[in-house]
Interface confidence: medium
């Protein structure tokens, strides 16, 4: 093949090599950019900055090499448009630092930074951690900080991500209340902070106030939908990002629904209970307290992470006609109590038959392993029985 006279020449089916001395000062308008998976750049002393716009359109890029060039600065968002990047070689440039944000969101298998005049500071704490944890092939490079010694020896005691404290009301919050949350941010070199409110939707009217180091958030006219929703405060410095999520508990009364009994592995009387705080439950059978046993017991389904309602069953193991009757579920929390009742018929009474009818006879083997006995009542110092707490 004839030698390529251009600044950048094709290499393989989807690669590009730019090695002609001093031919590039930016990566704009590279030929065939949208299909490139590999880009190799060398000897480009005028290529000093790598920014977001430089790699726009390189969505398929897997390998990027910029070596023996004049690269001084890589923007924190430089690789936003190259999410598939897995190998990044920036060796033998003029880089003094590289932000943790630059590699955030990438799944880099290899990161090469040797031969750069790195300056040891907290901004490289993330890289030191990669070295400690054996990530991206960093340990093998034995990275040095210019005039300061090995990166591995950099003191890091003061290199922490921001510390966040979110103040939430400890008293109950009622539907319709306004709630003030405050996020206190501490730490060195604070850069940005804010709230993530994606889960809130119509749960409240949101008003943000203040800025670093104290961010305010007013949730006005809250609804019960706010329960179990994350409100997240975040902050960033040159070391990294910190997030703290809190939930605001909006109190509302207990409610309960009962549904027709269904036969599954056992019989099940399905129920749904709601309320904040999570209600206590109690079952009645024909108006009297139903003491749960291994044959009749409450069972909950796995709760959804983002809602307060709980679903479950009163499980009945092989119920007979003596279990036929009226089942009532009581639910109580400090803001109200609720009940629901349902009639359940599991089996006809075999002793109620017309004398004219033939008498049914059945034979069953003797169960030699059966045991019988009353449920054991556990005593304690309270004068009360036990009811189920949901939550």
């Amino acid at each position: 093949a004839a030698p390529c006279p251009d600044a950048c020449c094709p290499h393989g089916s989807s690669g590009l090599r730019c090695t002609r001395d001093g031919a590039l000062d930016s990566l704009h308008h590279l030929p065939g950019a949208e299909n490139l998976t590999e880009l190799y750049i060398e000897n480009q002393q005028h290529l000093q900055h790598l920014e977001l716009r430089d790699l726009r359109g390189l969505g398929e890029l897997r390998n990027l090499t910029i070596v023996k060039s004049g690269l001084r600065f890589v923007a924190p968002d430089a690789f936003h448009f190259t999410p598939r990047l897995s190998r990044l070689n920036l060796s033998f440039n003029a880089l003094e630092s590289l932000s943790w944000k630059t590699v955030q969101g990438l799944s880099l298998q290899e990161l090469v930074l040797s031969g750069n005049p790195l300056h040891c500071s907290c901004a490289l704490r993330w890289l030191q951690r990669w070295e400690e944890e054996g990530l991206g092939g960093v340990p093998e490079q034995k990275l040095q900080c210019h005039g300061q010694g090995p990166l591995a020896h950099m003191p890091n005691a003061s290199c922490g991500v921001p510390t966040l404290k979110v103040q939430v009301p400890n008293a109950s919050v009622d539907v319709g209340d306004d709630v003030l949350l405050r996020c206190q941010v501490e730490g060195r070199g604070l850069e940005q902070a804010g709230w993530i409110l994606t889960e809130l939707e119509q749960s409240a009217t949101v008003m943000k106030s203040g800025g670093l180091p104290s961010l305010g958030l007013t949730l006005a006219n809250v609804t019960s939908d706010l329960n179990r929703k994350n409100v997240t405060c975040w902050a960033e410095n040159d070391v990294g990002r910190a997030e703290v999520s809190v939930q605001v508990n909006v109190s509302f009364p207990a409610s309960v629904q009962l549904h027709t009994a269904v036969e599954m592995h056992h019989w099940c009387i399905p129920f749904s209970v709601d309320g904040q705080p999570a209600p206590s439950l109690r079952w009645l059978f024909n108006g009297s307290v139903l003491n749960e046993t291994s044959f009749i017991f409450t069972e909950f389904l796995e709760p959804a992470a983002n809602e307060t309602v709980r679903h479950g069953c009163l499980r009945l193991n092989q119920p007979t006609h003596v279990n036929n009757g009226n089942y009532t579920l009581l639910a109580a929390n400090p803001f109200g109590q609720a009940s629901a009742s349902i009639m359940a018929a599991f089996m006809d009474n075999p002793f109620e038959f017309n004398p004219e009818d033939p008498i049914p006879v059945s034979f069953s083997p003797v169960d030699t392993n059966s045991t019988s006995g009353d449920p054991v009542e556990k005593k304690d110092e309270t004068p009360f029985g036990v009811s189920v707490a949901v939550g």
């Epitope: 109190s251 207990a254 209600p279 206590s280 109590q337 009360f384």
Partner: antibody, heavy 123, light 106 residues
Framework: EVKLLESGGGLVQPGGSLRLSCAAS????????MSWVRQTPGKRLEWVAY????????YYPDTVKGRFTISRDNSKNTLYLQMNSLRAEDTAVYYC????????????????WGQGTTVTVSS | EIVLTQSPATLSLSPGERATLSCSAS?????MHWYQQKPGQAPRLLIY???NLASGIPARFSGSGSGTDFTLTISSLEPEDFAVYYC?????????FGQGTKLEIK
């Protein structure tokens, strides 16, 4: 034997603050909810504050919400009531009372009460 | 809030007689609880969840009722039963007490 001993009451001017304490013994404090109830000079009982067994949930009636704060230190078996912006109508005997075991069992009331501590708000 | 009204305000009876104390709620409640208070003492739990006897309470005390009307009955009064009795609901927030019924010796 279950014992609840309140302290910290006294005479305070309107707008002032007081902190009541309740030392608990004879039961596993951290497994019970706790409340404060007051009795006015006219002998009416009024529930004032509630706290869950771990201290994460607190409830107050509107008459004291925003002024009173209930808290607990399970390592010291002690319940507290911080009372700010006190008013003449807060004058009462304040009782601490033990609530239900097994977390928040909302069917059951307060079963044991202390002997009370007197708070007088007057100028 | 749910208002609890106790009647009568004062009940004068003799030892051995039957005492019936009433408590009426302004809205329906699931349960009622009853306390006894003697002069200079803290309230003492008598009846919980409408009809259950608290620990150490004699069987002459009983409770009944549902919805808005509840009753505390003392079947045969003993001298130590003369005191003030309070009903209490914790079915609806805020939790409230009745104003009390004073049971005195006739």
């Amino acid at each position: 034997e279950v014992k609840l001993l309140e302290s910290g009451g006294g005479l305070v001017q309107p707008g002032g603050s007081l902190r009541l304490s309740c030392a608990a013994s004879g039961f596993t404090f951290s497994t019970y909810t706790m409340s404060w109830v007051r009795q006015t000079p006219g002998k009416r009982l009024e529930w004032v504050a509630y706290i869950s067994k771990g201290g994460g949930s607190t409830y107050y009636p509107d008459t004291v919400k925003g002024r009173f704060t209930i808290s607990r230190d399970n390592s010291k078996n002690t319940l507290y009531l911080q009372m700010n912006s006190l008013r003449a109508e807060d004058t009462a005997v304040y009782y601490c009372a033990r609530g239900a075991m097994y977390g928040n069992d909302f069917f059951y009331p307060m079963d044991y009460w202390g002997q009370g501590t007197t708070v007088t708000v007057s100028s | 809030e749910i208002v609890l009204t106790q009647s009568p305000a004062t009940l004068s009876l003799s030892p051995g007689e039957r005492a019936t104390l009433s408590c009426s709620a302004s809205s329906s409640v699931s349960y009622m609880h009853w306390y006894q208070q003697k002069p200079g003492q803290a309230p003492r739990l008598l009846i919980y969840t409408t009809s259950n006897l608290a620990s150490g309470i004699p069987a002459r005390f009983s409770g009944s009722g549902s919805g808005t009307d509840f009753t505390l009955t003392i079947s045969s009064l003993e001298p130590e039963d003369f005191a003030v009795y309070y009903c209490h609901q914790w079915s609806s927030y805020p939790w409230t007490f009745g104003q009390g019924t004073k049971l005195e010796i006739k």
